[in-house]
């Protein structure tokens, strides 16, 4: 009766045929050949890599699109069923109506069908465009990730080769360290042997020193005897000279007695016409007691009495209170003039103090105090300073106000500790303070990181031990 069938033509379009008697109606519907089903394989020229984070979202969106297409397919099938149902009804009507009416009805049905199909096609085209855009974007992202992964792989390879190189270097160094350790052990053994030999030598030297000390004691006794004899002899000579001058002056009254000249400091020596650097004998104020001092007659106009000098480490400055009181060392080299003399001198008139410093790099600096004096021994030779100028720091490295003098056997500092014992040497320690020019003498390349060296903090810092220092005084009105 009515023959309704669905088939495919050569170009892949769906055909809907309606057979009605001798009349046959064929409807050609367009097929969306661009869309792929979830089962059809997807071929891409992009390198397969780990998908980006948005990849999962894209997959989900594709699945949604597939569902939409599945729904469309179902809708088309429903449409077929609908056409079949309608056709059956319409065929009955066509049989009842005239032939001319059949054609009009069929055209109307066809038109409706084509309109609906065209609408679906348009919707599917939009969906296809969206899918294409999304796919293109995914391909680009995958390509970017591929490139970044390649870059990372190259970096990893470079780092791996670098690590291999380092491991080789490390094993080489390890071998070297082991060799050095072996060498070190051998050296330590030889050092221990040397130490044992030195200990034997030291014990021998100690016994020699004891012998020498005994001889020194004897020599000192002999020296005292000789000095007494010399003194007696000098007295006799002086008496003879007096007698002679007396008899001479009686004969020749024009010959005057030579006056004995004494100098209190190097300024007086300079003013008397002695303008050469050197050791001069000075006399204590209001006393006949004498002391030998070095006079600098050239620096800054001359007339400077040197009260301290460090230059080569030849003299030990870790001395007792008494030694710092009377002085020690050699005035032509390293020495300390003596606290008692300096105290007496600086209490007679106003003195300036100049401290000249040298480092191990060839630099020189100075600190000049326009007023300087030391208190008496009863007040522990406390230092008093005013008016700092100079290049060795804007802040005084001798703590202000002045401190008492401290030695290893005279702890007068402001520290719980014993600064003189800890930092070595006698000085006007605070607690313990920023300077100590009487510290341990350290040679070049051993002069840093020394807490007990020759220190002037506001010039060279705390751990730097200086090469040379000179402390000199001169009357303020010179």
């Amino acid at each position: 009766y009515n023959n309704f069938r669905k088939s495919m033509d050569s170009i892949g379009k769906k055909q809907y045929q309606v057979q009605h008697g001798s009349c046959s109606y064929t409807f050609l519907l367009p097929e969306m050949d661009n869309c792929r089903s979830s089962s059809s394989p997807y071929v891409s020229n992009a390198v397969q890599r780990d998908a980006p984070l948005e990849y999962d979202d894209s997959v989900q969106r594709l699945q949604v699109l597939e569902n939409i297409m599945e729904n469309n397919t179902q809708w088309l099938m429903k449409l077929e069923n609908y056409i079949q149902d309608n056709m059956k009804k319409e065929m009955v009507e066509i049989q009842q109506n005239a032939v001319q009416n059949q054609t009009a009805v069929m055209i109307e049905i066809g038109t409706n069908l084509l309109n609906q199909t065209a609408e679906q096609t348009r919707k599917l085209t939009d969906v296809e465009a969206q899918v294409l855009n999304q796919t293109t974007r995914l391909e680009l992202q995958l390509l970017e990730h591929s490139l970044s992964t390649n870059k990372l792989e190259k970096q990893i390879l470079d780092q791996t080769s670098e690590i291999n190189k380092l491991q080789d270097k490390n094993s080489f160094l390890e071998k070297k360290v082991l060799a050095m350790e072996d060498k070190h052990i051998i050296q330590l053994q030889s050092i221990k042997e040397e130490k044992d030999q030195l200990q034997v030598l030291v014990s021998k030297q100690n016994s020699i020193i004891e012998e020498l000390e005994k001889k020194i004691v004897t020599a000192t006794v002999n020296n005292s005897v000789l000095q007494k004899q010399q003194h007696d002899l000098m007295e006799t000579v002086n008496n003879l000279l007096t007698m002679m001058s007396t008899s001479n002056s009686a004969k020749d009254p024009t010959v005057a007695k030579e006056e004995q000249i004494s100098f209190r400091d190097c300024a007086e020596v300079f003013k008397s016409g002695h303008t050469t650097n050197g050791i001069y004998t000075l006399t204590f104020p209001n006393s006949t007691e004498e002391i030998k001092a070095y006079c600098d007659m050239e620096a800054g106009g001359g007339g400077w009495t040197i009260i301290q000098r460090r230059e080569d480490g030849s003299v030990d400055f870790q001395r007792t209170w008494k030694e710092y009181k009377v002085g020690f060392g050699n005035p032509s080299g390293e020495y300390w003039l003596g606290n008692e003399f300096v105290s007496q001198l600086t209490n007679q008139q106003r003195y300036v103090l100049k401290i000249h410093l040298k480092d191990w790099e060839g630099n020189e600096a100075y600190s000049l105090y326009e007023h300087f004096y030391l208190s008496s021994e009863e007040l522990n030779y406390r230092i008093h300073l005013k008016g700092l100028t100079g290049t060795a720091g804007k802040i005084s490295s001798i703590s202000q106000p002045g401190n008492d003098f401290s030695t290893k056997d005279g702890d007068n500092d402001k520290c719980i500790c014993k600064c003189s014992q800890m930092l070595t040497g006698g000085w006007w320690f605070d607690a313990c303070g920023p300077s100590n020019l009487n510290g341990m003498y350290y040679p070049q390349r051993q002069n840093t990181n020394k807490f007990n060296g020759i220190k002037w903090y506001y010039w060279k810092g705390s751990g730097y031990s200086l090469k040379a220092t000179t402390m000199m005084i001169r009357p303020a009105d010179f």
Partner: antibody, heavy 118, light 110 residues
Framework: QVQLVESGGGLVQPGRSLRLSCAAS????????MHWVRQAPGKGLEWVSG????????AYADSVKGRFSISRDDAKNSLYLQMNSLRAEDTAVYYC???????????WGQGTLITVSS | QSALTQPPSLSATPGQRVTISCSGS????????VNWYQQVPGAAPKLLMY???KRPSGVPDRFFGSKSGTSASLAISGLQSEDEADYYC???????????FGTGTKVTVL
């Protein structure tokens, strides 16, 4: 041999006072500076106070200044720490230590615990 | 707040070498001798090193002290289980006019 023995520790209420003693033996006491060092439970060492061998110089940590007072009695070979206005943060083991010269604590007592709590 | 800074902890296996650093300033480490103390749990501290590098009698020569500028170091070579303890550096401080301890370093022997 050198011995240092602390005493006087215990439980005390905040704001109250306590006096610690340290009995020394085996060395010339007046030759050495003496110190108090404390250690709060589970914490590090903290220097509290020190006194020179000649008793002329004393020093205190900022945390105890004005509240604690150090003293010594050379005739009794004893060191003392008078602690006033005690606070919860003063809770610690208190050690006395000997300093022969170089600010080095070569001998320590066994310590005495002070707990400041209400 | 301590004026001297140390690493809180260090660990090594027996026989290895560890180095504890102690960082200060010119008013303490830079200008005064540094001492090191060892404290085993439940005991009083013990003097381990004085005047930067000197060892009191009885302290093994595995312990080695040194100083450079405002930093001091304590090295323990050939680490042993009995070396497991807290280690403190300490020195005088001019600015504080007092003694200062480091923050302390716990050495663990694995």
């Amino acid at each position: 041999q050198v011995q240092l023995v602390e005493s006087g520790g215990g439980l005390v209420q905040p704001g109250r006072s306590l006096r610690l003693s340290c009995a020394a033996s085996g060395f010339t006491f007046d030759d050495c500076a003496m110190h108090w060092v404390r250690q709060a439970p589970g914490k590090g060492l903290e220097w509290v106070s020190g006194i020179s061998g000649n008793s002329k110089n004393v020093a205190y940590a900022d945390s105890v200044k004005g509240r604690f007072s150090i003293s010594r009695d050379d005739a009794k070979n004893s060191l003392y720490l008078q602690m006033n206005s005690l606070r919860a943060e003063d809770t610690a083991v208190y050690y006395c230590a000997r300093d022969p010269a170089y600010s080095q604590f070569d001998y320590w007592g066994q310590g005495t615990l002070i707990t400041v709590s209400s | 707040q301590s004026a001297l800074t140390q690493p809180p902890s260090l660990s090594a296996t027996p026989g290895q070498r560890v180095t504890i650093s102690c960082s200060g300033s010119s008013s303490n480490v830079g200008g005064y001798p540094v001492n090191w103390y060892q404290q085993v749990p439940g005991a009083a501290p013990k003097l381990l090193m004085y005047t930067d590098y000197k060892r009191p009698s009885g302290v093994p020569d595995r312990f080695f002290g040194s100083k450079s500028g405002t930093s001091a170091s304590l090295a323990i070579s050939g680490l042993q289980s009995e070396d497991e303890a807290d280690y403190y550096c300490a020195t005088w401080d001019d600015n504080l006019n007092g003694y200062v301890f480091g923050t302390g370093t716990k050495v663990t022997v694995l």
